[in-house]
């Protein structure tokens, strides 16, 4: 093969929790170089040298060489966040290269502490007992201590604290959650003792109190949310569904939910009771189907909720918002980056949807005319366009294997929005169209920068 300079790729850990270890490792992959003569060096952003490096022997692959270098940085240094990247430098007879290698973001995030209390009828057994549940969520790093106080004094009996767990997240720093339960006697709860869940994290103390004195009257606890039909549901199911969500029910046997039209005429409502929640309350959902034209006309629909805990029915009214400007979306389909394909692992296809109004949009991916499983792609929530008030943009990312992409398989991004002439538009991309967006690449970069 002919002599060639290396191509550099940053290597960073997929795990976002280096706070649990004393050091953070990042690496640098040099690929496709010849001859086999390469020297790695690492520098901080300020150009000072990093000494704790480790090199790995080069490997011959397809007539060219590949090599990696790793650097170990103390967690506490990374945690201060002064350097968002380090620089990997490579010397090679056919040219020197350098690459910024991003450092993992180690967020120090405080816990959000919530205490769930039993309802009046939530005590069982003889003597009657129930549980107070304390949840600390969204914190990082994972080291945390949870304790319970009763009237300001530490409680030792009836405390169970679960293992700290990582929260399921698609992006951002890894955060953690922990649950602690305190089993209490009904006599203690009704005696209006003050219980406190105390959470100690990174030298700070977070406290949440709970007492039967502080539990709001039942007639004010129940909440009703009237949820309008989404464009996505209208587009997918061809039906316009009104949803009435009722939360914080202490009992479920006496709830009724009904939808009525502006003229008082009842709309057939189907009610579902959910399971009980951690705080021992129930939720109920009342759904009613209406004609899309009735919804689009701006007619008002009212949800009415009755329950034994309510002195009078609760009502919520909704209608389609008036005067919302319609702007159809522009749709751009971006093929995988060549650098990514060179890694021979996966291929990421991006569907960029911009400039639309209202914010309700539906994105779906198709392959050979068949919808792809939603697990294969992720679609962002619509976000306001910074340069165009009242308009929104969203993106959907489909990940396929590099082999699938290289077979020439076509992928279609289908976008549905009420401002589109036929309510739907689509864009298709495959390996052969890979280079065709190059003329607009700069424009896309600008879009991403927003």
């Amino acid at each position: 093969g002919s002599a060639s300079a290396p191509t550099l790729f940053p290597l960073v850990s997929c795990e976002n929790s280096p706070s649990d270890t004393s050091s953070v490792a990042v690496g640098c992959l040099a690929q496709d170089f010849l001859p086999d003569s390469i020297t790695f060096s690492w520098k901080y952003k300020n150009n000072s040298d990093i000494s704790s490096t480790r090199g790995f022997p080069s490997v011959l692959r397809g007539g060219k060489y590949a090599a990696t270098s790793q650097v170990l940085l103390p967690s506490k240094d990374v945690m201060q966040g002064t350097d968002e990247h380090v620089v990997c430098k490579v010397q090679h007879p056919n040219g020197n290269k350098e690459k910024n290698v991003p450092l993992p973001v180690i967020a120090e995030l405080p816990p959000k502490v919530s205490v769930f209390v039993p309802p009046r009828d939530g005590f069982f057994g003889n003597p009657r007992k129930s549980k107070l549940i304390c949840q600390a969520t969204g914190f990082s790093p994972r080291q945390i201590q949870v304790s319970w106080l009763r009237e300001g004094k530490q409680v030792g009996s009836g405390v169970t604290t679960d293992q700290v767990q990582a929260e399921a997240k698609e992006s951002g720093p890894t955060t953690y959650k922990v649950t602690s339960t305190l089993t209490i006697k009904e006599s203690d709860w009704l005696g209006q003792s003050m219980f406190t869940c105390r959470v100690d994290h990174r030298g700070l103390t977070f406290q949440q109190n709970a007492s039967s004195m502080c539990v709001p009257d039942q007639d004010t606890a129940i909440r009703v949310f009237a949820i309008p039909p989404s464009f996505a549901s209208i587009f997918l199911t061809k039906s316009t569904k009104l949803t009435c969500l009722v939360t914080d029910l202490t009992t479920y046997d006496s709830v009724t939910i009904s939808w009525t039209r502006q003229n008082g005429e009842a709309v057939k409502t189907h009610t579902n009771i959910s399971e009980s929640h951690p705080n021992a309350t129930f939720s109920a959902v009342g759904e009613a189907s209406i004609c899309e034209d009735d919804w689009n006309s701006g007619e008002r629909f009212t949800c009415t909720v009755t329950h034994t805990d309510l002195p009078s029915p609760l009502k919520q009214t909704i209608s389609r918002p008036k005067g919302v400007a319609l702007h159809r979306p522009d749709v751009y389909l971006l093929p995988p980056a060549r650098e990514q394909l060179n890694l021979r692992e996966s291929a990421t296809i991006t569907c960029l949807v911009t400039g639309f109004s209202p914010a309700d949009v539906f994105v779906q991916w198709m392959q050979r005319g068949q919808p792809l499983s939603p697990e294969k792609y992720v679609t962002s929530a619509p976000m306001p366009e910074p340069q165009a008030p009242g308009r929104y943009f969203a993106h959907s990312i489909l990940t396929v294997s590099e082999e699938e992409w290289n077979t020439g398989e076509t992928y279609t991004c289908v976008v549905a929005h009420e401002a589109l002439p036929n309510r739907v538009t689509e864009r298709t991309v495959d390996k052969s169209t890979e280079g065709e967006v190059s003329a607009d690449e700069e424009g896309f970069e600008n879009l991403w920068a927003t």
Epitope: N126, I184, S187, G191
Partner: antibody, heavy 117, light 107 residues
Framework: EVQLVQSGAEVKKPGESLKISCKGS????????ISWVRQMPGKGLEWMGI????????IYSPSFQGQVTISADKSISTAYLQWSSLKASDTAMYYC??????????WGQGTLVTVSS | DIQMTQSPSSLSASVGDRVTITCRAS??????LNWYQQKPGKAPKLLIY???RLQSGVPSRFSGSGSGTDFTLTISSLQPEDFATYYC?????????FGQGTKVEIK
């Protein structure tokens, strides 16, 4: 007749394990709870912990947490108190008692545990 | 934990005497207080629950009073079978705690 019958006296060596029992009869075993109470020689009563046989939920006194294990087998209406490694200081009379809203209304006859090398 | 303090720790009395034993809680326990009687070599027996209610089968010479933090057990006319140790116990919250006991002896 409502009663709790405990297993017989035990003589053990330090470091040995032990499980004593308390069998309920004459009432619905899962409707009530069972508490265990220790009485060291010449001393007062100390509440050790409680078990709800219906769901096996246990609550321990901080003084006994990790020192003993309370369990129950509702199919044979029996509660248990066990040690994995006895100490000389575990020498005492152990009572099981039926707990209810009013307190400990029925007591077992007691099991004397002697730990000596 | 809620501490229970009994007084006196022991007393000597004669048959027919009126005997009073007091119990104090380290914090308010409303009426969640029981009294037990224990005779040597026997299991304790519930006498009074909810501070003042007589357990079924217990003679009426036993009575209880009090609420909050201060409680009293009274034996209106001491009988020979009443010589024993008496314990108060709070059951408002876990851990349930007993007083250290009051031994009633024959004078």
């Amino acid at each position: 007749e409502v009663q709790l019958v405990q297993s017989g006296a035990e003589v053990k060596k330090p470091g040995e394990s032990l499980k004593i029992s308390c069998k309920g009869s004459g009432y619905s075993f899962t409707t009530y709870t069972i508490s265990w109470v220790r009485q060291m020689p010449g001393k007062g009563l100390e509440w050790m912990g409680i078990i709800y046989p219906s769901d096996s939920d246990t609550i321990y006194s901080p003084s006994f947490q990790g020192q003993v294990t309370i369990s129950a087998d509702k199919s044979i209406s029996t509660a248990y108190l066990q040690w994995s490694s006895l100490k000389a200081s575990d020498t005492a009379m152990y009572y099981c008692a039926r707990s209810s809203v009013v307190g400990f209304d029925v007591w077992g006859q007691g099991t004397l545990v002697t730990v000596s090398s | 934990d809620i501490q229970m303090t009994q007084s006196p720790s022991s007393l000597s009395a004669s048959v027919g005497d009126r005997v009073t034993i007091t119990c104090r809680a380290s914090q308010s326990i409303s009426s969640y207080l029981n009294w037990y009687q224990q005779k040597p070599g026997k299991a304790p027996k519930l006498l009074i629950y909810a501070a003042s209610r007589l357990q079924s089968g217990v003679p009426s010479r036993f009575s209880g009073s009090g609420s909050g933090t201060d409680f009293t057990l009274t034996i209106s006319s001491l009988q020979p079978e009443d010589f024993a140790t008496y314990y108060c116990q709070q059951h408002l919250s876990w851990p349930e705690t007993f007083g250290q006991g009051t031994k009633v002896e024959i004078k």
